[in-house]
């Protein structure tokens, strides 16, 4: 089976405050089995933004239908962006288990927030 790659195509994305940000993530293999999670930041202080298996995450919606069995697109849209949302976002594949364990991370996409146009 093909080795899993996590494609976060954009190094950076810039969005005006109050708008929505789309962060793209595509995986190249359905294996290993396990959920995709999105985090802002890295290391112990990282913040969970979206978990395929949990929720709700009121400001986050998936761009594709992630419940589809063959889905490989885990891009998300974050609504009503504020300066507090700035940071680097990582799309991370977890391997199913008790608990799920981190398997592979995307390269990250830095979100910068512009002032709301007057």
């Amino acid at each position: 089976e093909e080795e899993l790659q996590i494609i976060q195509p954009d190094k950076s994305v810039s969005v005006a405050a109050g708008e929505s940000a789309i962060l793209h993530c595509t995986i190249t293999s359905l294996f290993p089995v396990g959920p995709i999670q999105w985090f802002r930041g890295a290391g112990p202080a990282r913040v969970l933004i979206y978990n395929q298996r949990q929720g709700p995450f009121p400001r986050v919606t998936t761009v594709s239908e992630t419940t589809k069995r063959e889905n490989m697109d885990f891009s998300i849209s974050i609504s009503n962006i504020t300066p507090a949302d700035a940071g680097t976002y990582y799309c991370i594949k977890f391997r199913k288990g008790s608990p799920d364990t981190e398997f592979k991370s995307g390269a990250g996409t830095e979100l910068s927030v512009r002032a709301k146009p007057s």
Epitope: Q5, I7, Q8, P9, D10, K11, S12, H24, T26, I27, T28, M72, G106, A107, G108, T109
Partner: antibody, heavy 119, light 103 residues
Framework: DVQLVESEGGVVRPGESLRLSCEAS????????MTWVRQAPGEGLEWVST????????YYADSVKGRFTISRDNSKNSLYLQMNSLRAEDTAIYYC????????????WGLGTLVTVSS | ALTQPASVSANLGGTVEITCSGG????YGWYQQKSPGSAPVTLI????NRPSNIPSRFSGSTSGSTSTLTITGVQAEDEAVYYC?????????FGAGTTLTVL
């Protein structure tokens, strides 16, 4: 074997319209994003437009936005490019390409078809 | 925009590297065009993936903002224009192309 076969292009006058088609075989067309790429004489490759697997989302280069429309018919394994208000600078070989899992990467290409816009 | 050298040369049987950098892409692909107007051929997609019909002498790697296409054991038929492609739509997808001359 994957095959992408573009329809014949042609010579048109500025302001006129032309529709290109691309017939696909050898892969599951309905699951694949599809793309048109062009190459003007003596120039490099230029991305033109991409359409999602279901056909509900389309992306366009600024140079063709509002003039070109990409579409597909999954029941016929066919991709289309409707080109309106053609300009001399649209003269190029147009290639049909199959997009890989992420749509800005292409794994298979057609042989291309020449479109000439000239008065 | 993606930046690549306009031309490179390599000795027959030697090794050549073509680089691509800049832009907003995390990932890169490489495409070969043997003559103007001929159909491009995909050599590498998403940094390192090589289609099954592509010889193993072609390989890709990405480090930071730079992608490198390496051809080991260069052959006469490798003389062509090589385009890099980026993963970010803002990059306009393709670089301007690098002409490889085999000496």
């Amino acid at each position: 074997d994957v095959q992408l076969v573009e329809s014949e292009g042609g010579v048109v006058r500025p302001g006129e319209s032309l529709r290109l088609s691309c017939e696909a075989s050898g892969f599951t067309f309905r699951n694949s994003y599809m793309t048109w790429v062009r190459q003007a004489p003596g120039e490099g490759l230029e991305w033109v437009s991409t359409i999602s697997d279901t056909g509900d989302t389309a992306y366009y280069a600024d140079s063709v936005k509002g003039r070109f429309t990409i579409s597909r018919d999954n029941s016929k394994n066919s991709l289309y490019l409707q080109m309106n208000s053609l300009r001399a600078e649209d003269t190029a070989i147009y290639y049909c390409a199959k997009s890989w899992i992420w749509w800005t990467f292409f794994d298979y290409w057609g042989l291309g078809t020449l479109v000439t816009v000239s008065s | 925009a993606l930046t690549q050298p306009a031309s490179v040369s390599a000795n027959l049987g030697g090794t050549v590297e073509i680089t691509c950098s800049g832009g907003n892409s995390n990932h890169y692909g490489w495409y070969q065009q043997k003559s103007p107007g001929s159909a491009p051929v995909t050599l590498i997609y998403a940094d390192t993936n090589r289609p099954s019909n592509i010889p193993s002498r072609f390989s890709g790697s990405t480090s930071g903002s730079t992608s490198t296409l390496t051809i080991t054991g260069v052959q006469a038929e490798d003389e062509a224009v090589y385009y890099c492609g980026g993963s970010s739509t803002g990059d306009g997808i393709f670089g301007a192309g690098t002409t490889l001359t085999v000496l």
